[in-house]
């Protein structure tokens, strides 16, 4: 060994290097919460990237730059390294445009806590070996949502839309020039029936066991769905997110009161299978699996 | 294919009567705001005459008022207009809407959906 390298493996096995790099990182973090930092920040900046250049080359020069087997790009954690002072260096000397996006990348700075602190090491460990482990569950759990998103578009499609509408009109009016024209949430509220503090209009459906409406409205299939348009089974991909919604409880009850709403009760069988398979196994499934691979990473 | 039957118009004179009347061939219609008969006189615009909603209320032009009377057999799914009194400005071709929801049979469709029209002339 050269003795540069002697010096440098010295340098990297001592725990005030450690120390030091923390606590830079952890200063860099503070710095970069600042929301208008003074002018001097910048000097500040340059000493964390001389400071971040600094650990790199002794880890270099101490166990060899890619070409062996325990060598500096060897490490994953040494890649977060490499990218953070590459893109100091790019955003500070190279002009590149739209810098703010580039910017962006200081914060995998904080990210270097990660492979300084021994028990967070653990941990990102056990969950990116938990995320190879949930390639299995997450595939189980996509064909299992793409078949109830599939079953729900059957069943469901379009009924989102049905609204109850007033049984006044004036006399040049008829439900599709209505339809053409309507625009604002006030056009909405003076042809369709709202329930107090609602921002929806009242759902209804077209069976006997659905939603029916009040006296002096009518059900029809006119305008967007409710809340903005975003809950619907009206193509694949909404429908979907509906299942996702469903699997993860995301005020799923409000999604199962409107499709039961517009559908009918009959339809809380599919809700029923769907919260028992998609909410209680398939999440315990991906949990067991994350618990698993957190427990082999200890060992 | 929607499907609305009028019948009923012809020849009378001023002061005669004659009696609509608007089917809806196909089970398909689900549920009506209202049914309605519109007219489009020669080189006028369709106008409405009278309609008639769901829940039974009803609404007429004020040129036909007290002479038309509209009415329904939801049982038939079929909707009349008795014309009484009727002036040769009554003269046009009389058109049935369905303004509502019908079944495609894969999904429920709302809107207007009108028939081929009756010719009404009144001349002596």
């Known amino acids: 060994f050269s003795p540069l390298r002697r010096i440098s493996i010295k340098i990297l096995v001592h725990s005030l290097f450690s120390m030091l790099i923390m606590c830079t990182i952890l200063t860099n973090c503070i710095f970069m919460t600042m929301n208008n930092p003074p002018d001097w920040t910048k000097n500040v900046e340059y000493t964390f990237t001389g400071i971040y250049t600094f650990e790199s080359l002794v880890k270099i020069l101490a166990r060899g730059f890619c070409v062996g087997e325990f060598t500096f790009l060897r490490d994953p954690w040494n890649w977060l390294d490499f990218v953070v002072i590459v893109f100091a260096y790019l955003t500070e000397f190279v002009n590149l445009g739209n810098v703010s996006a580039l910017r962006t990348f200081r914060v995998l700075r904080a990210l270097k806590t990660i492979s300084v602190i021994p028990g967070l090491k653990t941990i990102v460990g056990a969950l990116i070996q938990s995320v190879k482990k949930l390639s299995d569950v997450m595939i189980l759990t996509v064909f299992c949502l793409s078949v109830f998103a599939l079953i729900g578009l059957q069943l469901f499609m379009g009924n989102l839309k049905h609204k109850c509408f007033r049984n006044s009109l004036e006399n040049n009016e008829t439900l599709e020039s209505i339809m053409n024209t309507l625009e604002s949430e006030e056009d909405f509220r003076k042809y369709f029936y709202y329930l107090e503090g609602s921002k929806d209009a009242l759902l209804c459906g077209f069976s006997t066991d659905s939603g029916q409406c009040p006296e002096g409205y009518t059900c029809v299939k006119i305008g967007r769905n409710p809340d903005y348009g975003y809950t619907s089974f009206d193509t694949f991909s909404w429908a979907f997110l509906a299942l996702f919604r469903l699997m993860t409880q995301d005020y799923w009850e409000n999604l199962y009161q409107q499709t039961l709403r517009a559908a009918g009760k009959t339809y809380m069988i599919f809700f029923v299978v769907v919260i028992f398979l998609g909410s209680f196994y398939l999440i315990n499934l991906i949990l067991a699996v994350v618990a698993m691979a957190y427990e082999e990473q200890n060992q | 294919e929607v499907q609305l039957v009028e019948s009923g118009g012809g020849v009378v004179q001023p002061g005669g009567s004659l009696r609509l009347s608007c089917a809806a061939s196909?089970?398909?219609?689900?549920?009506?705001?209202?049914t309605g008969w519109y007219r489009r006189a020669p080189g006028k615009q369709r106008e409405l005459v009278a309609r008639?909603?769901?829940?039974?209320?009803?609404q007429y032009a004020d040129s036909v008022k007290g002479r038309f009377t509209i009415s329904r057999d939801n049982a038939k799914k079929t909707v009349y207009l008795q014309m009484n009194s009727l002036r040769p400005e009554d003269t046009a071709l009389y058109y049935c809407?369905?303004?509502?929801?019908?079944?495609?049979?894969?999904?429920?469709?709302?809107?207007?959906?009108w028939g081929q029209g009756t010719l009404v002339t009144v001349s002596s």
């Open positions: 008639i909603y769901n829940e039974g209320n009803t």
């Open positions: 809407l369905f303004s509502g929801t019908i079944s495609t049979g894969r999904e429920y469709r709302s809107g207007d959906y």
């Open positions: 196909h089970r398909q219609f689900i549920r009506d705001v209202f």
